[in-house]
């Protein structure tokens, strides 16, 4: 028996369902009584789901997994993982035993989009050219860790005096806070871009300083 899985990682959004594809080619006359299918976490060998002795033995993993029972006889050994969590990320082994056996591993990459950044200034009043100002760009509930880029109004990257921190919450999602310290000119626009490297999703935030008062672009 030969087991086939997709070589590319499966990307799944947090709280959605994911299908880990696995297939084998049944011989003529194959019956489910011959099939032994085991899904497990590759690294820890923790059992996730199994089909043995002719029947679905059920989920051994948070009761969030299911096979496609009607498709098994056709060689579809895929696993459905429901309500994906950050902690589900990793490699899963699909093991199929009939006359002989084979296995293959498929990677699950979990992702969550970052929120539109909110921008804050400190100080936020009585600003004068030459003042040092701290601009904070905050984006929430994303995964995996973000890449953060700052640019000025002309699109020139700002790399000096940037401090970025990323903190995971209880669900494993990251809140990003990036702080830019700049000396104010007469006016200027400062924008931050928060990129999710897996989803290739960019979330933009910007602040424009035009003397007095300060203006923030309307929400997109």
């Amino acid at each position: 028996v030969e087991v086939q899985v997709s070589e590319d990682p499966v990307v799944a959004l947090v709280d959605t369902d994911a299908t880990l594809r696995c297939s084998f080619s049944p011989e003529p006359g194959f019956s489910l009584a011959q099939l032994n299918l085991i899904w497990q976490l590759t690294d820890t060998k923790q059992l996730v789901h199994s089909f043995t002795e002719g029947r679905d033995q059920g989920s051994a993993y948070s009761n969030r997994t299911a096979l496609f029972p009607d498709l098994l006889v056709q060689g579809n050994a895929s696993l459905r993982l429901q309500r994906v969590r950050v902690t589900d990320e990793g490699s899963y082994t699909c093991f199929v035993s009939i006359q002989d056996f084979d296995s293959a591993a498929v990677s699950l990459q979990v992702a969550a989009p970052y929120s539109k950044p909110s921008m804050t200034l400190e100080p936020n009043k009585d600003l004068r050219p030459g003042n040092m100002v701290t601009i904070t760009c905050s984006s929430y509930q994303g995964y995996p860790e973000a890449e953060v880029f700052w640019k000025d109004g002309q699109g020139v990257p700002l790399t000096g005096n940037v401090t970025t921190s990323q903190m995971a919450n209880e669900r494993g999602l990251f809140d990003v806070h990036s702080v830019l310290r700049v000396v104010l000119g007469a006016n200027g626009t400062y924008s931050c871009l928060v990129r999710n490297p897996v989803l290739q999703q960019d979330a933009h935030g910007s602040v424009t300083i035009t003397g007095q008062p300060l203006t923030f672009p309307p929400e997109a």
């Epitope: 028996v1 009584a33 011959q34 032994n36 085991i38 497990q40 060998k45 043995t52 002795e53 082994t93 093991f95 035993s97 006359q99 002989d100 056996f101 084979d102 296995s103």
Partner: antibody, heavy 119, light 109 residues
Framework: QVQLQQSGAEVKKPGSSVKVSCKAS????????ISWVRQAPGQGLEWMGG????????NYAQKFQGRVTITADESTSTAYMELSSLRSEDTAVYYC????????????WGQGTMVTVSS | EIVLTQSPATLSLSPGERATLSCRAS??????LAWYQQKPGQAPRLLIY???NRATGIPARFSGSGSGTDFTLTISSLEPEDFAVYYC???????????FGQGTKLEIK
């Protein structure tokens, strides 16, 4: 071609334990099913148990349940069989065997390890 | 637990003769049955797997047949090197566990 190399002969006292190793070379160890079979002098073959390293699942013949432990170290491509509470009837040649990658049929055998249990 | 019974216990034949060895299972083993040959001081050698498939390098004079509970190993024309002990072995479906028959000794008449 897969080859299995077993550890050397052992002489043990009744009540003690023995651990026999079986090192595989020439293939993908994690995708083997390794069995342990013993043969007492002048007697037939007796399957003791086996392990599929990629699953980490070992299972044992009823007769040896609770007295035998089979493990596998994927990093060294080595399987182990430990038999405890030895008695004189455990004097035998102990073989490891495999079908190689993805096969259950035992067509590749180690050279055997003689274990003698004597007071 | 499945029990395999081999018959006869000893078979005395001459080179060139046909040998028929029997293996009966106490319950159906599908086709997960293998035959091994063992000579004194040597490890067993796989001859037949899945009831009828010859293992790599095994001469065509060896053949296996049967399914369910009754299986046969046939050696069409005995060569001097064929005199040895023969074991049948079944494999359960899951988890994979094995049982050997007690063996048939094939000796020169």
């Amino acid at each position: 071609q897969v080859q299995l190399q077993q550890s050397g002969a052992e002489v043990k006292k009744p009540g003690s334990s023995v651990k026999v190793s079986c090192k595989a070379s020439g293939g993908t160890f994690s995708s083997y099913a390794i069995s342990w079979v013993r043969q007492a002098p002048g007697q037939g073959l007796e399957w003791m148990g086996g392990i599929i390293p990629i699953l980490g699942i070992a299972n044992y013949a009823q007769k040896f349940q609770g007295r035998v432990t089979i493990t596998a170290d994927e990093s060294t491509s080595t399987a182990y069989m430990e038999l405890s509470s030895l008695r004189s009837e455990d004097t035998a040649v102990y073989y490891c065997a495999t079908g190689g990658s993805g096969r259950y049929a035992l067509d590749i055998w180690g050279q055997g390890t003689m274990v003698t249990v004597s007071s | 637990e499945i029990v395999l019974t081999q018959s006869p216990a000893t078979l005395s034949l001459s080179p060139g003769e046909r040998a028929t060895l029997s293996c009966r299972a106490s319950q159906s083993v599908s086709s997960y049955l293998a035959w091994y040959q063992q000579k004194p001081g040597q490890a067993p050698r796989l001859l037949i797997y899945d009831a009828s498939n010859r293992a790599t390098g095994i001469p065509a004079r060896f053949s296996g047949s049967g399914s369910g509970t009754d299986f046969t190993l046939t050696i069409s024309s005995l060569e001097p090197e064929d005199f040895a002990v023969y074991y049948c072995q079944q494999r359960s479906n899951w988890p994979p566990s094995y049982t050997f028959g007690q063996g048939t000794k094939l000796e020169i008449k």
